[in-house]
């Protein structure tokens, strides 16, 4: 199995740790972990094209999209491939991460490591919104926390 | 030209940013950027096997060394892939990092995108010191500063 | 400029069928999901109809399911809704526009009313 | 079915006033709320989207709040143009709805 690790941090009070697994090439990718200090409801979650934190978050760069697709959601056959949705914070602000993604890779040409997960200020509306950002970014907002993926024991 | 980026950072002053540059697979790794807070004089500098900072740079485990080999200088044929050797600071804080080495690559199996960049308390001793720890680590001690290196544009 | 001009409205009796379009321009309409959103005389706004930026996925609210069916010609840059077995009250202006959940620009509309 | 009480259904106000206009959800709906506005024989223009984003082209005096089932519209400084009816919309689930509208009308 190839695991990866995500330490994410950002200038306010967002923070979290997201792991991810996955059994062998070819097979879906698990994340698993928590986002702390978030704002009640959903917060668009990506992967960044760069592993670049030279200038915070903002260097990380678009959305991983090796393919040049549109923005979508996770489910979508047209999506970044660095388009996981979002995660959802309670009241308490924590987003409880669980996802199972087939899209992702932690090997081969489109790997995600040395690449940027990014939580968002706002939720991502998945491609569907009426203006031209919602093609590209779902109107996710500001980059609140981020970190580089790496490569875990 | 594949280029890589990795911001250093810990608990203390260290801090800093080192890019790495790769003009073609086979061909050597440039290393250039800069380290502030350090003390006047020689600092260990490695990249370790896993890009893990949930614990800080402690997770990032032990320098990585795909070939089981020990630990040496950047010109020793024994050496671990990880094994830059030393940066100097002047007696303002500061390394200049300016590092051609031919070991470490941005690709392949042993590609070093998605491990960790350290830093060090002290010098690295390149394997010739008296005792075990200096097949293994060089002596160079505490982890001062480190970052996960990720994909650049 | 983005654009969306409807057509096709019309008098139809009971039972009757239309078939709505709607034109875009000034925006890369492929890339888009699109919707159709109706105003009853002197009411509110309803949301019919919404389909994917490729035509894949298209959702009704249930007043219209099995009744109406929307498309699109993304080489034509058209939207169309054909209504079937329309009712009376079925009678409004119909808007197109864009997005599939909510909407930013929206067309002038076409009137539909459903009469004998 | 989401059910959303806007209110008031009429508001009667003067140019420089501040107004505030609210959507009531029978069900949380996390961010996913719109606000239009609708001029007499023209379509609808969207106004602010995800609770509190204002669509470009905007007026700041246009601002939008709240969360899970209670949102507000408020329009800081009333001006002229801004007579018109105002809608809020769902896009939390299926059917996409609105609110009946408020009508903001000259004092």
């Known amino acids: 199995a190839m695991k990866a690790v995500c330490v994410l941090k950002g200038d306010g009070p967002v923070q979290g740790t997201i792991h991810f697994e996955q059994k062998a090439s070819g097979e879906p990718v698990v994340l698993s972990g928590q986002i702390t200090g978030l704002t009640e409801g959903q917060h668009g979650f990506h992967v960044h094209q760069y592993g670049d934190n030279t200038q915070g978050c903002t260097s990380a760069g678009p959305h991983f999209n090796p393919h040049s697709k549109k923005h979508g959601g996770p489910a979508d056959e047209e999506r970044h491939v660095g388009d996981l949705g979002n995660v959802t914070a309670g009241k308490d602000g924590v987003a409880n991460v669980s996802i199972e993604d087939r899209v992702i890779s932690l090997s081969g040409e489109h790997s995600i490591i040395g690449r940027t997960m990014v939580v968002h200020e706002k939720q991502d509306d998945l491609g569907k919104g009426g203006n031209e950002e919602s093609t590209k970014t779902g109107n996710a907002g500001s980059r609140l926390a981020c970190g580089v993926i790496g490569i875990a024991q | 030209a594949m280029k890589a980026v990795c911001v250093l950072k810990g608990d203390g002053p260290v801090q800093g940013t080192i890019h790495f540059e790769q003009k073609a697979s086979g061909e050597p790794v440039v290393l250039s950027g800069q380290i502030t807070g350090l003390t006047e004089g020689q600092h260990g500098f490695h990249v370790h096997q896993y890009g893990d900072n949930t614990q800080g740079c402690t997770s990032a485990g032990p320098h990585f060394n795909p070939h089981s080999k020990k630990h040496g200088g950047p010109a020793d044929e024994e050496r671990h892939v990880g094994d830059l050797g030393n940066v100097t600071a002047g007696k303002d804080g500061v390394a200049n990092v300016s590092i051609e080495d031919r070991v470490i690559s941005l690709s392949g199996e042993h590609s070093i995108i998605g491990r960790t960049m350290v830093v060090h308390e002290k010098q690295d001793d390149l394997g010739k010191g008296g005792n075990e720890e200096s097949t293994k680590t060089g002596n160079a001690g505490s982890r001062l500063a480190c970052g996960v290196i990720g994909i650049a544009q | 400029e983005v654009q969306l001009v409807e057509s096709g409205g019309g008098l139809v009796q009971p039972g009757g069928s239309l078939r709505l379009s709607c034109a875009a321009s000034g925006f890369t309409f492929s890339s888009f999901w699109m919707s159709w959103v109706r105003q009853a005389p002197g009411k509110g706004l309803e949301w019919v109809a919404n389909i994917k930026h490729d035509g894949s996925e298209q959702d009704y609210v249930d007043s219209v399911k099995g009744r109406f069916t929307i498309s699109r010609d993304n080489a034509k840059n058209s939207l169309y809704l054909q209504m079937n077995s329309l009712r009376a009250e079925d009678t409004a202006v119909y808007y197109c526009?864009?997005?599939?959940?909510?909407?930013?620009?929206w067309g002038q509309g076409t009137l539909v009313t459903v009469s004998s | 079915v989401i059910w959303m009480t806007q209110s008031p259904s009429l508001l009667s106000a003067s140019t420089g006033d501040r107004v505030t206009i609210s959507c009531r959800m029978s069900q949380g709906i996390s961010s996913y709320l719109a606000w239009y506005q609708q001029k007499p024989g023209k379509a609808p223009e969207v106004l602010i989207y995800a609770v509190s984003t204002l669509q470009s082209g905007v007026p700041s005096r246009f601002s939008g709040s709240g969360s899970g089932t209670d949102f507000t519209l408020t329009i800081s400084c009333l001006q002229s143009e801004d007579f018109a009816t105002y809608y809020c919309?769902?896009?939390?689930?299926?059917?996409?709805?609105f609110g009946q509208g408020t009508k903001l009308e000259i004092k």
């Open positions: 919309q769902q896009y939390y689930s299926f059917p996409y709805t």
């Open positions: 526009a864009r997005g599939g959940i909510w909407f930013g620009p």
